[in-house]
């Protein structure tokens, strides 16, 4: 799915009002020094692509995130604010239901959610203005940036 045409401000509002709090609840009791973020994103559509992948695609050691409250709210936000997103997810949802019945919090899942928090931070405030893409739907001014 191409996230370019999503309403980023509405998704950001949904994240800040509820999803962020659900992520914090999920991570409660975890030391803030425990995980280093290894997944990054460069602009808002890219961030949503990575967020979708980490939230809904089962990975080795963490197959159950899609059933968490934050995942369901993420799915709802994308369905509402990304045109045509729902249609692309029907098969994925059915596969998800077959994949896992119970919710299990593993260390791998905690690490994955820590990565998600980092991706959402960059979605909320992209550090760099990427040439050829717009971080903000109404943004056409130039952001000064450097790559090291």
């Amino acid at each position: 799915y191409d996230f370019t045409n999503c309403d980023f401000e509405k998704i950001k509002a949904a994240y800040l009002s509820t999803i962020s709090k659900d992520l914090i609840t999920y991570m409660s009791g975890t030391k803030s020094t425990e995980f280093n973020n290894t997944v990054s994103c460069s602009n808002r559509p890219h961030c949503l692509t990575e967020i979708q992948s980490l939230t809904f695609n089962p990975t080795a050691g963490c197959a159950s995130l899609a059933k968490e409250m934050f995942a369901m709210k993420t799915k709802a936000a994308l369905a509402i604010w990304c045109p045509g997103y729902s249609e692309t997810q029907i098969n994925a949802t059915q596969a998800m239901k077959k994949a896992r019945k119970s919710k299990v919090t593993t260390n791998k899942c905690l690490e994955q959610v820590s990565q998600l928090q980092g991706l959402w931070r960059r979605f909320n405030r992209p550090l760099l203005k990427q040439q050829g893409s717009s971080d903000y739907k109404d943004d056409d001014d130039k952001h000064h940036h450097h790559h090291h």
Epitope: E9, A13, Y15, L16, S20, I24, S32, T33, E34, F35, N36, N37, S40, S114, Q117, G118, W120, R121, R122, F123, N124, R125, L127, L128, K129, Y136, D138, D139, D141, H143, H144, H145, H146, H147, H148
Partner: antibody
Framework: EVQLVQSGAEVKKPGSSVKVSCKAS????????IEWVRQAPGQGLEWIGV????????NYNENFKGRATLTADKSTSTAYMELSSLRSEDTAVYYC????????????WGQGTTVTVSS | DIVMTQTPLSLSVTPGQPASISCKAS??????VTWYLQKPGQSPQLLIY???NHYTGVPDRFSGSGSGTDFTLKISRVEAEDVGVYYC?????????FGQGTKLEIK
């Protein structure tokens, strides 16, 4: 406990450079942006720039472009702000701050480093 | 650059009375506004993020509202510990910019 501890006060000559350090502890340094803000005596807050310690990406306020350089050392969890070609108007308290968990605010601030530029 | 203009620049309030600070942006900043308080001799501290969300430990007598270009910070009942300079900040566009600050004193 998250802490940002900055280097001590500096007195510099006009035209010279200053390098202020900001040592972070209590969290995964690479995961959060570090912002730099300054405050001239009796004045408000002015944003200098931001660095992503994870990959070194930076974004600068145009007012400081070419004079300010932000760097980060992951091995020591320390961020640095170097300001060159100092002038008297650069006399200020310089703060480092960490972005919050949502990426929409600065939740932890250093204690500030006073830089005095005087001949 | 987006200019954030605060009014009033200073206010003196009797303990227990309300206080209100306005912040106007020179162009729309959506909901990307944060409020900080800088107490005398201290570093700034976070109060409200994304217009109306309380930071951890901030008393609920503080509230934020607004969208687009007009924003307000309200203190329902001012207490002695609330003295200091209040700053609004936008993070919708680089460079990030702050208001000039509003100094709150106790009568």
């Amino acid at each position: 406990e998250v802490q940002l501890v900055q280097s001590g006060a500096e007195v510099k000559k006009p035209g010279s450079s200053v390098k202020v350090s900001c040592k972070a502890s209590g969290y995964a340094f690479s995961n959060y942006l570090i912002e730099w803000v300054r405050q001239a005596p009796g004045q408000g807050l002015e944003w200098i720039g931001v660095i992503d310690p994870g990959n070194g990406d930076t974004n600068y306020n145009e007012n400081f472009k070419g004079r300010a350089t932000l760097t980060a050392d992951k091995s020591t969890s320390t961020a640095y702000m170097e300001l060159s070609s100092l002038r008297s108007e650069d006399t200020a308290v310089y703060y480092c701050a960490r972005e919050d968990n949502t990426g929409t605010a600065f939740d932890y601030w250093g204690q500030g480093t006073t830089v005095t530029v005087s001949s | 650059d987006i200019v954030m203009t605060q009014t009033p620049l200073s206010l003196s309030v009797t303990p227990g009375q309300p206080a209100s600070i306005s912040c106007k942006a020179s162009q729309s900043v959506s909901s990307d506004v944060t409020w900080y308080l800088q107490k005398p001799g201290q570093s700034p501290q976070l109060l409200i993020y994304y217009v109306s969300n309380h930071y951890t430990g901030v008393p609920d007598r503080f509230s934020g509202s607004g969208s687009g270009t007009d924003f307000t910070l309200k203190i329902s009942r001012v207490e002695a510990e609330d003295v200091g300079v209040y700053y609004c900040q936008q993070h919708h566009r680089f460079p990030l910019t702050f208001g000039q600050g509003t100094k709150l004193e106790i009568k």
